[in-house]
Amino acid sequence: MMTGTIETTGNISAEKGGSIILQCHLSSTTAQVTQVNWEQQDQLLAICNADLGWHISPSFKDRVAPGPGLGLTLQSLTVNDTGEYFCIYHTYPDGTYTGRIFLEVLESSVAEHGARFQIP
């Protein structure tokens, strides 16, 4: 039975040209996290595998940085980065947990960042 829950940064906004941290946290389970995939719609952004470390998809290498923790940092944001992002936690023995973050990239310099979420 899957008892865990994913907490995320939720809906967030950021300014064009800036950067943002996407973070998820899996709680309420003792399952072992074997891998976390970060995806944007149907595109794989990055993988953090517990055995191997981080791999950033080649098309995002210039603008995506690993971490902090299992999170992902998006840099040099453009309006085209607006959309849904998913953290997919592969765990044993529970299986897969998915969290959703909606990022809006604004032209304005008055973009309000969502509440910063910190992994304890």
Epitope: T34, Q35, I47, N49, A50, D51, L52, G53, W54, H55, I56, A65, P66, G67
Partner: antibody, heavy 120, light 107 residues
Framework: EVQLLESGGGLVQPGGSLRLSCAAS????????MSWVRQAPGKGLEWVSS????????YYADSVKGRFTISRDNSKNTLYLQMNSLRAEDTAVYYC?????????????WGQGTLVTVSS | DIQMTQSPSSLSASVGDRVTITCRAS??????LNWYQQKPGKAPKLLIY???RLQSGVPSRFSGSGSGTDFTLTISSLQPEDFATYYC?????????FGGGTKVEIK
Amino acid sequence: EVQLLESGGGLVQPGGSLRLSCAASGFTFGSYGMSWVRQAPGKGLEWVSSISGSGSTTYYADSVKGRFTISRDNSKNTLYLQMNSLRAEDTAVYYCARVAGSSGWAFDYWGQGTLVTVSS
Amino acid sequence: DIQMTQSPSSLSASVGDRVTITCRASQAISNYLNWYQQKPGKAPKLLIYAASRLQSGVPSRFSGSGSGTDFTLTISSLQPEDFATYYCQESYSTPFTFGGGTKVEIK
């Protein structure tokens, strides 16, 4: 005692194929990621590929992507590297190495290496 | 990709000398930096992982420091068995790049 023993190297013509093996002992093989690292004669070290403990996740260097395939057989405690479409620049000593996931993904144990020579 | 620049590429030193090798990453890699020693005809050996942690069985005369982009490997008192080539490597993200190496030779 952790031991890694590579085999399968040799002389092959450009465009040819070769399969390297790495026999592991002294640790729970399926609990560790594994990597191949190569060293051209008189040159430095170059990471080639990595595979997770379960074998479900693989990473490759751009220079070998689409030509080399890493795999493992945990029932035989053996790591493999299938090398196709070999080029002169693939000439190197190939080392298998264990990935220490709990130690910042360093390569904590290495085999003695096997020499691959690509020449006509 | 992250570039790792090691310096010097070679150095001459005497037994008992303090030796320092530096490694610079082209972008911040936190503490995901490892150091290896390689002797001619042999496989590399892990000395330091996570920038400053000594691998089990490695003599305490070896130490590592740094974070972000700049890292240092120090041998406090060079011993005859320390003459070798030393490599840094980032394990921050693929392709897990190695530095070009530093050859430590006998003066």
